[in-house]
């Protein structure tokens, strides 16, 4: 994921409890990872700016048969105001860059932690 800096509103901003639950889930995924996450599946990298929840979902929804990220997919769909289906792409995808799901989750987690802290200390 790119654009780790520059806190544009990730819109719509989930309430802190929901954001906290998403972060906890991503923490669980990264901590419980034994074999390569989702068999090393690759997903499009995204810009972590406005609309990133939908963009993250659009990327991850193309990974099928990976139970480890199913809860994350469901949680992200709750943060995204429109219906997302496989094969859908927004301008937030960095279309020339694919990364492993594990790296995608790690980068998303880092950014969401920053957003959570920013929300706590405003």
């Amino acid at each position: 994921l790119t654009c780790l800096g520059g806190f544009a509103s990730p819109g719509p901003v989930p309430p802190s409890t929901a954001l906290r639950e998403l972060i906890e889930e991503l923490v669980n995924i990264t901590q419980n990872q034994k074999a390569p996450l989702c068999n090393g599946s690759m997903v499009w990298s995204i810009n972590l700016t406005a609309g990133m929840y939908c963009a993250a979902l659009e990327s991850l929804i193309n990974v099928s048969g990976c139970s480890a990220i199913e809860k994350t997919q469901r949680m992200l769909s709750g943060f995204c105001p429109h219906k997302v289906s496989a094969g859908q792409f927004s301008s937030l995808h960095v279309r020339d860059t694919k990364i492993e799901v594990a790296q995608f989750v790690k980068d998303l987690l880092l950014h969401l932690k920053k957003l959570f802290r920013e929300g706590q200390f405003n």
Epitope: K113, F116, R117, E118, N122
Partner: antibody, heavy 120, light 107 residues
């Protein structure tokens, strides 16, 4: 190894101001929130407030509003707490404490404490 | 503010005893609770976070449990170095609040 090293003990007169520092090493300073805790002699722990070193945003205990000012200097990986209008009741050990909210908790690491004595 | 009521305020126990300390929050804190150990003249040391997760390097005789408003720190078999004061902390919402502390003394 994570270390939080605080400035030394201070003796101040009533009405004075004191600024305590907390120098961080062993992790990226802006990755974790930084908090400050008061412990009066023979008493328990009380949260003063916290700061996000990345943004400088703060949260504080209403009890310490107007008493404690929290700042962070990213260039030196150092957090500061300034206590103003000191009174004898402010005599206490002050700790800085930080951590990953989601991995170890926000108070995972502690400084050694700074004793502030307010006496005329 | 969330009030954390810790009990007992002090207890006497012998080496090898099982010790239980409780913290009750005035509202649901969603398991955002830490436990600390403090020895005289020293900074607190984190034992448990998120109600039941043991910090790396902390002996397995320490364990945390609970949810909602009620939480417990258990020391399964008291070691001579465990005589200290223990505090709980809720970090579910600001202002973060500590319990009043439990002093574990030698019987």
């Amino acid at each position: 190894e994570v270390q939080l090293v605080q400035s030394g003990a201070e003796v101040k007169k009533p009405g004075a101001t004191v600024k305590i520092s907390c120098k961080v090493s062993g992790y990226t300073f802006t990755d974790y929130e930084m908090h400050w805790v008061q412990q009066a002699p023979g008493k328990g722990l009380e949260w003063i407030g916290g700061i996000d070193p990345e943004t400088g945003g703060t949260a504080s205990n209403q009890k310490f509003k107007g008493k404690a000012t929290l700042t962070a200097d990213k260039s030196t990986d150092t957090a500061y707490m300034e206590l103003s209008s000191l009174r004898s009741e402010d005599t206490a050990v002050y700790y800085c404490t930080s951590g990953d909210y989601f991995g170890g908790g926000p108070f995972a690491y502690w400084g050694q404490g700074t004793l502030v004595t307010v006496s005329s | 503010d969330i009030k954390m009521t810790q009990s007992p305020s002090s207890l006497s126990a012998s080496v090898g005893d099982r010790v239980t300390i409780t913290c009750k929050a005035s509202q649901d804190i969603n398991s955002y609770l830490s436990w600390f150990q403090q020895k005289p003249g020293k900074a607190p040391k984190t034992l448990i976070y998120r109600a039941n997760r043991l910090v790396d390097g902390v002996p397995s005789r320490f364990s945390g449990s609970g949810s909602g408003q009620d939480y417990t720190l258990t020391i399964s078999s008291l070691d001579p170095e465990d005589f200290a004061t223990y505090y709980c902390l809720q970090y579910d919402e600001f202002p973060y609040t500590f319990g009043g502390g439990t002093k574990v003394e030698i019987k």
